[in-house]
Every structure is written in structure tokens, then in C-alpha cells.
């Protein structure tokens, strides 16, 4: 028969045959032959191999540093590598999480849009008319102004985007 | 370790039928290319035949060809040789090997082989 | 079909001494990737082949290293650098090169 130019899914060609890839989890011993299947080993403790492959070595899992702040969010499998996050209170400072930053905090005037996670940082925005925010925070969100006539009172100062208003009692109509 | 223990052989009449069988164990069988090779009394190795892992390839020689055929059950780890028409020319102990793949081409492991006597 | 002839067919040899066994092929055993299917396999008395060396030159495992194999192409050599007395038997040389797989006559040994 004619040697192939191409082999089927989860095939790769060698000496003009076609061999089954390894398996995720597993690396390659030896090809195959025209008799023998390929020979593939599973990958050791802390290695693994994500694709079917015909990979000679396991790649090591990932180590999270704590040095770096990072922790291991999941451990890795034979098929699987290590996945890193950031110690409470620090974010990943790319998609990779290989180091860790300190969240940030949303300066006054601006609110916690959405709190930080192991892999994002605090996303923040202004506080719009009729919000505040008067502290420094990686969790507060933008506060409503003080609703005066509910507490049958009027406004004696505005707010605005850094204080709540001020709240005084209504001056009464002599008779 | 790596065993292969053969069975079937004894005497037989030409022209006759008789089929061999081989029980592997010791090593993944289902994912090695097998062979017989046979030996007249005070003779040489002579090959017979090969199969591939998954049946797929199989090869006989031509001394043999059209009257035996190589087979395997890899559900049950077992390789055969059915031997029809018999001669007296066949009269060997047949030997059932494991190839050795890539890195040794041809059989490296070699079971104890089993006698076959054609005689009238 | 590849025809395989060896030299000497009997050998009788010392012990300590070495030996030397030629394989010719009637084709080329050498392969597109470099390597040679030529296999050497020894015969004790009574026993069932083993394999000695593979691919022309590579020792099989649990082989002593005084067994070594070289050539290249149709010539081929199985040295015993120091006979024991346990090398007796009959050596064959054959090739995995193609189907029909073919052996040499074998080249029995005998010790002195």
C-alpha cells in the first residue's frame, strides 16, 4: 500500500506511517511500527501533559510562590497544570498569575464598582449625583445622599460626590 | 516479567488441521505486533508469520501461505495459529514471540514453543 | 525475499578467548532513519532463542557487554570479546528490514 501523507485525528506521521498520539496525562517512550502500538508512559508526580501528544518529557506543574503571594487556587493532575491565585487582599497582576498585587482601593469621590478577586482588580467609578463616598476603600460602594424630607427635616448643606448632605430641622411659620 | 506459554501442538495426520495458541502476560499485549517462528527437528529458525497490535497488518510466509493463518484475541490475551492442510514438511516446534517495537525490531521475547508432528 | 548467509556455520573456540561471527544480506538492512534491522539472537541447547542485539548494534537488556554488534548495510559482525562457557549455542543473524522476516542458517558455537 501507498505510505500516507496524512493521518486521521489524534495520529501523527512517522516514517511514513501513521501512529496514535499519547494520551493527555501521558508522554512518549517510542513510536510505533507497523506492527507495535505507540508506547507512552504516564507523566510523573507533579508533571502533566494537557493534549494528546507525542511529547518525550512531562511539563512540571506550575508552583505557586507565596513569596509572590500566589497560592494554589486547584492542583494540578496528570493532565492538568497547577492553577495559581493571589492571597486574600491581592489580585493576579496578569492573565498567567505568576506574581500579585495589592488591591486597590477606591479613592473618595469614587465607589467599588466591583470588588476585587484573586485574578481582577478593584474596578471603581464616580460616585454620581446623589452618592457619596468620604473613605478610601477596596470594598465600599458609592452611598446615597441622606434622604432629608424623610426624616421631616430640609437640606442644610449639599452633598456632593465626597459628603452626604446635612440635615437641619424645618424653620416653622409663626402664627 | 514477560510470559508466553504456547499450546495445541501434538500429532497429527496430513492433510489435517490443528491450531496453536499463545497466552500472553506480563506486558500490555494488546499494544504489541506478535509472531510465530518454527523449528524443524536439528534445523534453523524459520519465521511464519507476524501480526500487528490491532489485527490491522498481518504477513505469512510463503511456505505457509493459503494453509495457516495468524489471529489474536486481545480481549483475551491470546495470539492463535490455525494451521490447515498439513504436510509433513511442518513438523516443528513452534515458537510464538512478542515484537519488540521501535527500539528492536523483530521478536524479543520467545515463549518455550510447542511440538507439532505431522505424521501418517 | 532477503537472503541471509552466515560465516562460520560452527566455531569451536577457548574460553577467554574471543569470537567473531559474519552475517551478510542479500539487500541492504539499512533503513531511511539510519538504523539497520539486523537482530542476533543465541540458541542455547534446549532452550528457546534470545535476543542478543537489535537494530545492528544495540544490546538487548541483561545482554553482557561482551556481546557487540556492528556493520552496516548487507555486512554485518557479532563479536564475544571473552568466550564463557555459557555462550555455547546456535547464534542466528536475521532481518526485520521487510516481510517475509528471514534468519541465517545460525552459526553453532562449541567450547574447547
Known amino acids: 500500500p501507498e505510505p500516507p501523507t496524512a493521518c486521521r485525528e489524534k495520529q501523527y506521521l512517522i516514517n511514513s506511517q501513521c501512529c496514535s498520539l499519547c494520551q493527555p496525562g501521558q508522554k512518549l517512550v517510542s513510536d510505533c511500527t507497523e506492527f507495535t502500538e505507540t508506547e507512552c508512559l504516564p507523566c510523573g508526580e507533579s508533571e502533566f501533559l494537557d493534549t494528546w501528544n507525542r511529547e518525550t518529557h512531562c511539563h512540571q506543574h506550575k508552583y505557586c510562590d507565596p513569596n509572590l503571594g500566589l497560592r494554589v487556587q486547584q492542583k494540578g493532575t496528570s493532565e492538568t497544570d497547577t492553577i495559581c491565585t493571589c492571597e486574600e487582599g491581592w489580585h493576579c497582576t496578569s492573565e498567567a498569575c505568576e506574581s500579585c498585587v495589592l488591591h486597590r482601593s477606591c479613592s473618595p469621590g469614587f465607589g467599588v464598582k466591583q470588588i476585587a478577586t484573586g485574578v481582577s482588580d478593584t474596578i471603581c467609578e464616580p460616585c454620581p449625583v446623589g452618592f457619596f463616598s468620604n473613605v478610601s476603600s477596596a470594598f465600599e460602594k458609592c452611598h446615597p445622599w441622606t434622604s432629608c424630607e424623610t426624616k421631616d427635616l430640609v437640606v442644610q448643606q449639599a452633598g456632593t460626590n465626597k459628603t452626604d448632605v446635612v440635615c437641619g430641622p424645618q424653620d416653622r411659620l409663626r402664627a | 516479567q514477560v510470559q508466553l506459554v504456547e499450546s495445541g501442538g501434538g500429532v497429527v495426520q496430513p492433510g489435517r488441521s490443528l491450531r496453536l495458541s499463545c497466552a500472553a502476560s506480563?506486558?500490555?499485549?494488546?499494544?504489541?505486533?506478535m509472531h510465530w517462528v518454527r523449528q524443524a527437528p536439528g534445523k534453523g529458525l524459520e519465521w511464519v508469520a507476524v501480526?500487528?497490535?490491532?489485527?490491522?497488518?498481518?504477513y505469512h510466509a510463503d511456505s505457509v501461505k493459503g494453509r495457516f493463518t495468524i489471529s489474536r484475541d486481545n480481549s483475551k490475551i491470546t495470539l492463535y495459529l490455525q494451521m490447515n492442510s498439513l504436510r509433513t514438511e511442518d513438523t516443528a516446534v513452534y515458537y510464538c514471540?512478542?515484537?519488540?517495537?521501535?527500539?528492536?525490531?523483530?521478536?524479543?521475547?520467545w515463549g518455550q514453543g510447542t511440538l507439532v508432528t505431522v505424521s501418517s | 525475499d532477503i537472503v541471509m548467509t552466515q560465516s562460520p556455520l560452527s566455531l569451536t573456540v577457548t574460553p577467554g578467548e574471543p569470537a567473531s561471527i559474519s552475517c551478510r544480506s542479500s539487500?541492504?538492512?539499512?533503513?531511511?532513519?539510519?538504523?539497520?534491522?539486523l537482530d542476533w539472537y543465541l540458541q542455547k541447547p534446549g532452550q528457546s532463542p534470545q535476543v542478543l542485539i537489535s537494530?545492528?548494534?544495540n544490546r538487548a537488556s541483561g545482554v553482557p557487554d561482551r556481546f557487540s554488534g556492528s556493520g552496516s548495510g548487507t555486512d554485518f559482525t557479532l563479536k564475544i570479546s571473552r568466550v564463557e562457557a555459557e555462550d555455547v549455542g546456535v547464534y542466528y543473524c536475521?532481518?526485520?528490514?521487510?516481510?517475509?522476516?528471514?534468519f541465517g542458517p545460525g552459526t553453532k558455537v562449541d567450547i574447547r
Open positions: 514471540a512478542r515484537d519488540g517495537g521501535i527500539a528492536a525490531p523483530g521478536p524479543d521475547y
Open positions: 506480563g506486558f500490555t499485549f494488546s499494544s504489541y505486533g
Open positions: 501480526i500487528s497490535y490491532e489485527e490491522s497488518n498481518r
Open positions: 539487500q541492504s538492512l539499512l533503513y531511511s532513519n539510519g538504523y539497520n534491522y
Open positions: 537494530l545492528g548494534s
Open positions: 536475521m532481518q526485520a528490514r521487510q516481510t517475509p522476516f528471514t
